[in-house]
């Protein structure tokens, strides 16, 4: 789902207050609800009728350092006989998410938010076909 | 997918540098790749064999203010005849994501990262049946 543009108003102080110095803000250490965990069905990526594989990207200057991307294994979906049926389609489900980028020069460390598009998994859909008009 | 625990090392300065004052860091204004957009299939939530609905939660002190949660519509999956087949299961696909929480007291504004569990959509899976041993 889409993350709306900030318009930077979210990060501004109220109008009656002095502006933020040097275009930066105070980010408190620690993460709220850090212990919260995904409780997804086991092996969902293999048991799905639109199965997918995972690829892990790793970047030490990003939090989280690991970002996992899914790729649909098939064009079609897997039917009850375990065969691929191309009358249906495996399509990716995407999510916009935030990560934190770390930037440092010597002892000066700052952080910036970054938007990342993550493919979370795949789902099986009925195809939609548009007729191309001939004039 | 899971976001690993910070262990707070990510947000610390190198050991040879003076520590961060007051338990906060510098967060630069602006979002990298802010214009990046999800290019998901139209009406994917209705066309899926494991369809879902969306619920929007809104919080003005969170960025993004809108967080969209999916809920699977069915226990089973929709078959070629448009009927629910309970020999298969619609299951949620979850993703851990970061949001930014704004905290203010008068003109003092600070921000903190928060982990949120988002259900992004649903997929159709073959059920797993575990045999319960009798002693």
């Amino acid at each position: 789902r889409k993350i709306p543009k900030v318009g930077h108003t979210f990060f501004q102080k109220p109008e009656s207050c002095p502006p933020v110095p040097g275009g930066s803000m105070k980010l408190d250490i620690g993460i709220i609800n850090e212990n919260q965990r995904v409780s997804m069905s086991r092996n969902i990526e293999s048991r799905s009728t639109s199965p997918w594989n995972y690829t892990v990207t790793w970047d030490p200057n990003r939090y989280p350092s690991e970002v996992v991307q899914a790729q649909c294994r098939n064009l079609g979906c897997i039917n009850a006989q375990g065969k691929e049926d191309i009358s249906m389609n495996s399509v990716p489900i995407q999510q916009e998410t935030l990560v934190v980028r770390r930037k440092h020069q010597g002892c000066s460390v700052s952080f910036q938010l970054e938007k990342v598009l993550v493919t979370v998994g795949c789902t099986c859909v009925t195809p939609v076909i548009h007729h191309v008009q001939h004039h | 997918r899971k976001i690993p625990k910070v262990g707070h090392t990510f947000f610390q300065k190198p050991e040879s540098c003076p520590p961060v004052p007051g338990g906060s860091m510098k967060l630069d204004i602006g979002i990298i790749n802010e214009n990046q957009r999800v290019s998901m299939s139209r009406n994917i939530e209705s066309r899926s064999t494991s369809p879902w609905n969306y619920t929007v939660t809104w919080d003005p002190n969170r960025y993004p203010s809108e967080v969209v949660q999916a809920q699977c519509r069915n226990l089973g999956c929709i078959n070629a005849q448009g009927k629910e087949d309970i020999s298969m299961n619609s299951v949620p696909i979850q993703q851990e994501t970061l949001v930014v929480r704004r905290k203010h007291q008068g003109c003092s504004v600070s921000f903190q990262l928060e982990k949120v569990l988002v259900t992004v959509g649903c997929t159709c899976v073959t059920p797993v049946i575990h045999h319960v041993q009798h002693h």
Partner: nanobody, 122 residues
Framework: EVQLVESGGGLVQPGGSLRLSCAAS????????MYWVRQAPGKGLEWISA????????YYAESVNGRFTISRDNAKNSLYLQMNSLKSEDTAVYYC???????????????GGQGTQVTVSS
């Protein structure tokens, strides 16, 4: 403007062969997955074959697997379907189709104009 024009259909006896062609224009043909679909009298569209942009990955419906071969010539912006061992149940109007979006699978497609009629009868 996207155009997909099918040709090569006709009347053929059971066991016979035909080669269908699709001439594509108005888009970067070599970047798109391409498909053959068909519609038998009184029935819905049936997806019968798919081919990746580079021609590497091929998919066939079970009903045609082993009898039909999909191919493409990116230099000529053309898609082909070689149909062998034809059966009466292959009687249909055949259309070529392309992905609606390039580079991202959405399960949405564009298909061409009139299609080409294939009739298998003795």
């Amino acid at each position: 403007e996207v155009q997909l024009v099918e040709s090569g259909g006709g009347l053929v006896q059971p066991g016979g062969s035909l080669r269908l062609s699709c001439a594509a224009s108005g888009f970067t043909f070599s970047s798109y997955w391409m498909y053959w679909v068909r519609q038998a009298p009184g029935k819905g569209l049936e997806w019968i074959s798919a081919l990746a942009p580079g021609g590497g990955n091929r998919y066939y419906a079970e009903s045609v697997n082993g009898r039909f071969t999909i191919s493409r010539d990116n230099a000529k912006n053309s898609l082909y379907l070689q149909m062998n061992s034809l059966k009466s149940e292959d009687t249909a109007v055949y259309y070529c189709a392309k992905d609606h979006n390039v580079g991202y699978r959405t399960g949405e497609y564009d298909y061409g104009g009139q299609g080409t009629q294939v009739t298998v009868s003795s």
